[in-house]
């Protein structure tokens, strides 16, 4: 027979030879880190067919690391369901607890003994320090000094000294989250008031209000013969500006085949019409309105769309 087979878990006793006589026997022993559990054979014989009789290393078992208990309020999860050396142990804490120590331990061979690479971690209760105090506002449970996992506080704004109220910018409720960190930044309390939205040749159709505070939403429509340049819906943002900006109502121009009528007093020119939130006059663009919805008015491609002089 030629050289005997090699195995992962056991090794030949003695030096291998280039060839073996029929009937000659070779013995194996478990490799370092493995131990023998009877009754399986750990030898083989050179058969008369010049082949080795069947043998396996199933009798040699990997050394295992000591059993690790689940940490209190957590779990120890063997990576491959085994404690054998070469494998990992993962540690997970239950919700509301966080890990102190190594998240992964390795089962390592020290000499012929399998031991863990470190001490098992512990699971500590998630606790948060009090959330931040905010200017012009307060939060619930302000007297509490330590907050547990998922404990929530809700912010509210103080009454304003002036005519306009404080608006709460951001989420009013935050909770004590993983890593002992609050779920988000604290909100802000400040006066947010947008200017009255003026649209020439159009009007507001919804969202009417005495004043326009944070998140106030207003919709517009243009007069007949005018089209909306911008969004028909605007919202008062946290900077006291309309987002998107206050739209404009621009005149639908007549087809180029007919001479445009002279401006009457009811028509405005673009250089002199402004919304309060718009910027100062710059170069006047050539406006291309969308396809007209107004019966009797041309579609844009039917006429030349010049600047609004």
């Amino acid at each position: 027979c030629e050289e005997p087979p090699t195995f992962e878990a056991m090794e030949l006793i003695g030096k291998p030879k280039p060839y073996y006589e029929i009937g000659e026997r070779v013995d194996y022993k478990c490799k370092k880190g493995y131990f023998y559990i009877p009754p399986l054979a750990t030898h083989t014989i050179c058969d008369r067919n010049h082949t080795w009789l069947p043998v396996s290393d199933d009798a040699c078992y990997r050394e295992t690391c000591p059993y690790i208990r689940d940490p209190l309020n957590g779990q120890a999860v063997p990576a491959n369901g085994t404690y054998e050396f070469g494998y990992q142990m993962h540690f997970i804490c239950n919700e509301g607890y966080y890990l102190i120590g190594e998240e992964i331990l390795y089962c390592e061979l020290k000499g012929s003994v399998a031991i863990w690479s470190g001490k098992p971690p512990i699971c500590e209760k998630v606790l948060c320090t009090p959330p931040p105090k905010i200017k012009n506002g307060k939060h619930t449970f302000s007297e509490v000094e330590v907050f547990e996992y998922l404990d929530a506080v809700t912010y509210s704004c103080d009454p304003a000294p002036g005519p306009d109220p404080f608006s709460l910018i951001g989420e009013s409720t935050i909770y004590c989250g993983d890593n002992s960190v609050w779920s988000r930044a604290a909100p802000e309390c400040k006066v947010v008031k947008c200017r009255f939205p003026v649209v020439e040749n159009g009007k507001q159709i919804s969202g009417f209000g005495k004043k326009f505070y944070y998140k106030a939403t207003v919709m517009f429509e243009c007069d007949k013969g005018f089209y909306l340049d911008g969004s028909d819906t605007i919202v008062c943002d946290s900077n006291s500006t309309w987002d998107p900006p206050v739209p404009k109502c621009l005149k639908v121009l007549p087809p180029s085949s007919t001479k445009p009528p002279a401006l009457s007093h009811s028509v405005s020119t673009s250089s002199t019409t402004k919304s309060p939130a718009s910027s100062a006059s710059g170069p006047r663009p050539t406006y291309k309105p969308p396809v007209s919805n107004y019966p009797g008015y041309p579609k844009p491609e039917e006429g030349i769309l010049d600047s609004l002089d």
Epitope: K193, C194, R195, F196, V198, E200, N201, K203, Q204, F208, K210, K211, T272, T273, K274, S275, P276, A277, S278, S279, A280, S281
Partner: antibody, heavy 118, light 107 residues
Framework: EVQLVESGGGLVQPGGSLRLSCAAS????????ISWIRQSPSRGLEWLGV???????NYNSAFMSRFTISRDDSKNTAYLQMNSLKTEDTAVYYC????????????WGQGTLVTVSS | AIQLTQSPSSLSASVGDRVTITCRAS??????LNWYLQKPGQSPQLLIY???SLFSGVPDRFSGSGSGTDFTLKISRVEAEDVGVYYC?????????FGQGTKVEIK
């Protein structure tokens, strides 16, 4: 508190021009939206136009071809330029600070009288 | 332009009377209506904004109501200092316009 004082009124012939001034004291004219309003016995109160803090303007279209509102920040003054004046433009002209960005006229000046007559 | 029509055009009341002035708009203006008082020899002064909100310093005997096209200014107990011309003003649409005025006199 800003005070607005109108000036520049007087007698002018039909077809003539006049520039009214609105001087601000105790504050910057560029910090406020300034409207011009006029009042006559025959036509009552009429809003003429507004200049916003950003320099933009809106006008009453009935007067837009003849009246122009402007502002000179260095002089802390707003202006109403009136051209092609007619006898029916005879009125007391007020400049007015728009209330905090809202079209509520809470701060009226004392007004300046413009008489258009030949 | 939106027309505002006030009624009556003038009225005479005794001190302590309840006075009602109406303002009708030619189209719906939501609550975008203000009231002013122009006392004799003075510039107009803002009394009420947004239909019913009392401007600072205005006595609470003044009140406003209405919505859409019909609006009312009430003086619960008129006083001698309340004489003058009362104007309504809309601001839903440019040009902002005023009513023709209601003159209030004391008997």
């Amino acid at each position: 508190e800003v005070q607005l004082v109108e000036s520049g009124g007087g007698l002018v012939q039909p077809g003539g021009s006049l520039r009214l001034s609105c001087a601000a004291s105790g504050g910057s004219v560029s910090s406020y939206d300034i409207s011009w309003i006029r009042q006559s016995p025959s036509r009552g109160l009429e809003w003429l136009g507004v200049i916003w803090t950003d320099g933009g303007t809106n006008y009453n279209s009935a007067f837009m071809s003849r009246f122009t509102i402007s502002r000179d920040d260095s002089k802390n003054t707003a202006y109403l330029q009136m051209n092609s004046l007619k006898t029916e433009d005879t009125a007391v002209y007020y400049c007015e600070r728009v209330y905090d960005g809202y079209p509520w006229f809470a701060y009226w000046g004392q007004g300046t009288l413009v008489t258009v007559s030949s | 332009a939106i027309q505002l029509t006030q009624s009556p055009s003038s009225l005479s009341a005794s001190v302590g009377d309840r006075v009602t002035i109406t303002c009708r708009a030619s189209q719906g203006i939501s609550n975008y209506l203000n009231w002013y008082l122009q006392k004799p020899g003075q510039s107009p002064q803002l009394l009420i904004y947004y239909t019913s909100s009392l401007f600072s310093g205005v006595p609470d005997r003044f009140s406003g109501s209405g919505s859409g096209t019909d609006f009312t200014l009430k003086i619960s107990r008129v006083e001698a200092e309340d004489v003058g011309v009362y104007y309504c003003q809309q601001y839903i649409k440019l040009p902002w316009t005023f009513g023709q005025g209601t003159k209030v006199e004391i008997k």
